[in-house]
């Protein structure tokens, strides 16, 4: 007991009355008015309570505080007095404050702020939708993937900030009159190749796709090591140069200079070169051929073999240049005699004739290409007189059934067993190398030295053996007549062709040999 | 008759880029490749490289890689030979000629003095 | 790289006398050709393909040689003549020419 009369024990929150009585301080309450027992307890009244007769007034909240209670404005208003709290209705001062213009930049980008009591609402601009996370973010609606399909198939969906784009595929373009981007965009595909929009290198052919194009590598061409076909990178090298090496087992450095001339001009070729490349590779082999040096000493079948090799690769390559010139004749002569005539032509329906010193060829264009074949159709004919070095003593081999009418009409091959070349070497090819039947025959009018009396003539073609060398042979060839210095001769097949005079002796006036004119 | 105009003489500070034309005529312009060569003063010929008008396609050295450029217009008939970080050691004459494998370069332009000095 | 070596580096001859000017290489060329310089101008083609005469080019010009070894000739020397003469190879890329051998007037 205290001696001023004031009990020692009251509970938190209380105060003593007397000696032995406390009461709780206000904004607290116990369950009887007066405590008498140190046990009882004080606890806080919620003035904010609904059954409270407390009342803060409208746009206001009560907040219920340890033994008292404030009055606070709702979040979006303030108190106009500018007293933060307040106590009752009537020193209410709440209003709503407008938020939209306290900060313009509320709802960020793309966002209209609208001001509502007591708070405010973003309109999201269109092609924006509020954040679903972020209700004041107004975010891009992306047209392209919301399932709207907005444009047509021939476009491409482009999403945009707050909008979006129908434009062409690449590789398409507006269809007459159609815009580029609205929604009512109607694209077509586009012809790279003829409107010249293409990449493709001058090694290829390109060839329209929906919606692109690819490049393929030109007929006689191969991709570059490396690169593959088809693609609109495709760089392609002409196959020519690179198959055409020396013979193997042949060891000539005359030789392996010219190979070496001919890899050269293939290096650095391009389809624009070739009129200059096929006159630099004929002039090498006019070259090689008027001074074989030490092809020479080389053994015959050795020096056979060369002159096939060089044969079959000459014409090969100039198959595959010759489809790069433009359309026209054009006549090539060397010092050594070595003569070339071509002629390119878009497909015509007639005969050619080319023209040399000492040969003339005849035939049809339709020969010239095979079916499919975009390019130009060719047709070439080579004269190489210096080929007669290289294929002296070469064999010829006859057919049975003409081996037996000569040694039935002659008496038999004489002892000198090699037949005598007459004529300068020719070479006919055309664009289409599928030339072992042709539809129609080829005629060759060969000019060539004095035939010895009583001799036989015959047309032959080197016939290119399994073995690399060859021989020469009469098969698909026949001669339709000969006088002393020409000779007719009329083929099925297109080769390396020649005028021979084999060591027979004819025994009497022979109708084959009666000139046909 | 063939012509190779080049453009006129440049004077250029280190690290700077030049770009050098040569316009072609009197001839099919894609019948031949465009050659680059460049001569310091008082030293002898240097090949830099060259580009095909027919495709755009380029050769050229090593020493260059990286530096050179060379391009071509085929509706002018030019070509261009654009060099980069330039350093005193490029002062030369720059010449363009028309060059194939078998005839050599056979038409040169006048020359085209480019001078790099700070 | 192939590398062309020319020789003599210089020269010396009156004219009327025969100039004969080398240019050995670090490997076989197929397509040698030479031209010559005069100062102030671009180099003039003389001989391509080692021994063809170049369009406008006087016969007193001739070219030889095969696989390293190729020669330059001005049989008769003209007053012309006196020039900066480089031997070129175009037979690997990079192309290289030779240093050039200088004919001056003795």
């Known amino acids: 007991q205290d001696s001023r009369g004031c009990a020692r024990w009251c509970p938190q929150d209380s105060s003593c009355v007397n000696a032995t009585a406390c009461r709780c301080n206000p904004g607290f309450s116990s369950f009887s008015e007066i405590i008498t027992t140190p046990m009882e307890t004080c606890d806080d009244i919620n003035e904010c309570a609904t059954l409270s007769k407390v009342s803060c007034g409208k746009f206001s909240d009560c907040w219920n505080t340890e033994g008292s209670y404030d009055c606070v404005c709702s979040p979006g208003y303030e108190p106009v007095s500018g007293a933060k709290t307040f106590k009752n209705e009537s020193e209410n001062t709440c209003q709503d404050v407008d938020e939209c213009q306290q900060n313009p930049r509320l709802c960020k980008s793309y966002g209209t702020c609208v001001n509502t009591l007591g708070s405010y609402t973003c309109q999201c601009l269109p092609g924006f939708k509020l954040k679903p996370e972020d209700p004041k973010l107004c975010t891009d609606v992306n047209e392209c993937t919301s399932g709207q399909n907005p444009c047509h198939s021939s476009t491409h969906c482009l999403n945009n900030v707050g909008s979006y784009q129908c434009r062409c595929r690449p590789g398409w373009q507006p269809i007459p009159g159609s815009p580029n981007g609205p929604n009512n965009t109607v694209c077509e595909d586009v012809d790279e190749c003829s409107s010249g929009q293409h990449q493709c290198d001058s090694s290829t052919v390109c060839f329209n796709t929906v919606g692109s194009y690819s490049c393929r590598c030109r007929p006689g061409w191969k991709p570059r090591h490396g690169i593959p076909n088809n693609q609109k990178d495709t760089v392609c090298e002409d196959m020519t140069f690179s198959t055409w090496t020396p013979p193997p087992g042949v060891h000539s450095q005359t030789l392996s200079r010219f190979f070496d001339k001919v890899q050269d001009l293939g290096r650095d070729y391009k389809p624009g070169l070739a009129n200059n490349t096929i006159q630099s590779i004929l002039q090498a082999l006019d070259e090689l051929l008027e001074a074989p040096g030490d092809l020479e000493t080389l053994p015959r079948l050795q020096q056979h073999c060369v002159a096939s090799h060089l044969l079959d690769g000459l014409e090969d390559v100039l198959r595959g240049l010759s489809k790069n010139l433009s359309n026209g004749l054009l006549n090539f002569s060397y010092p050594a005699g070595t003569e070339l005539s071509l002629e390119v032509q878009k497909q015509v329906d007639r005969s050619v004739t080319l023209r040399q010193n000492q040969a003339v060829m005849q035939l049809d264009w339709n020969q010239a290409q095979k079916s499919g074949d975009p390019g130009p159709s060719v047709v070439g004919l080579v004269s190489i007189p210096g080929m007669g070095k290289l294929l002296a003593e070469a064999p010829l081999v006859l057919e049975p059934e003409k081996q037996m009418l000569l040694h039935e009409t002659h008496q038999g091959l004489l002892q000198d067993g090699s037949p005598i070349l007459l004529s300068d070497v020719i070479s006919a090819f055309l664009s289409n190398n599928d030339t072992q039947n042709l539809s129609s025959p080829v005629t060759f009018t060969f000019s060539h030295r004095s035939v010895i009396p009583r001799q036989k003539v015959l047309c032959v073609f080197w016939e290119h053996g399994q073995n690399g060398c060859g021989h020469w042979a009469t098969t698909g060839c026949s001669t339709i007549g000969t006088r002393d210095t020409s000779t007719i001769c009329r083929c099925t097949h297109l080769s390396s062709f020649a005028v021979l005079m084999a060591h027979y002796d004819v025994q009497e006036e022979d109708p084959v040999l009666t000139v046909i004119t | 008759q063939v012509q190779l105009q080049q453009s006129g003489a440049e004077v250029k500070k280190p690290g700077a880029s030049v770009k050098v034309s040569c316009k072609a005529s009197?001839?099919?312009?894609?019948?031949?490749?465009m050659q680059w060569v460049r001569q310091a003063p008082g030293q002898g010929l240097e090949w830099m490289g060259a580009?095909?008008?027919?495709?755009?396609?380029?050769r050229h050295t090593q020493k260059f890689k990286g530096r050179v450029t060379m391009t071509r217009d085929t509706s002018t008939s030019t070509v261009y030979m654009e060099l980069s970080s330039l350093r005193s050691e490029d002062t030369a004459v720059y010449y363009c000629?028309?060059?194939?494998?078998?005839?050599?370069?056979?038409?040169w332009g006048q020359g085209t003095l480019v001078t790099v000095s700070s | 790289e192939i590398v062309l070596t020319q020789s003599p580096a210089t020269l010396s001859l009156s004219p009327g006398e025969r100039a004969t000017l080398s240019c050995s290489a670090s490997s076989s060329v197929s397509y040698m050709h030479w031209y010559q310089q005069k100062p102030g101008l671009a180099p003039r083609l003389l001989i391509y393909?080692?021994?063809k005469l170049a369009s406008g080019i006087p016969d007193r010009f001739s070219g030889s040689g095969s696989g390293t070894d190729f020669t330059l000739t001005i049989s008769r020397l003209e007053p012309e003549d006196f020039a900066v003469y480089y031997c070129?190879?175009?037979?690997?890329?990079?192309?290289?020419f030779g240093q050039g051998t200088k004919v001056e007037i003795k």
């Open positions: 000629a028309r060059g194939f494998t078998a005839y050599g370069m056979d038409y």
């Open positions: 009197g001839y099919t312009f894609t019948n031949y490749w």
């Open positions: 070129q190879q175009w037979s690997s890329n990079p192309l290289t």
């Open positions: 580009v095909y008008p027919g495709d755009g396609d380029t």
């Open positions: 393909d080692t021994s």
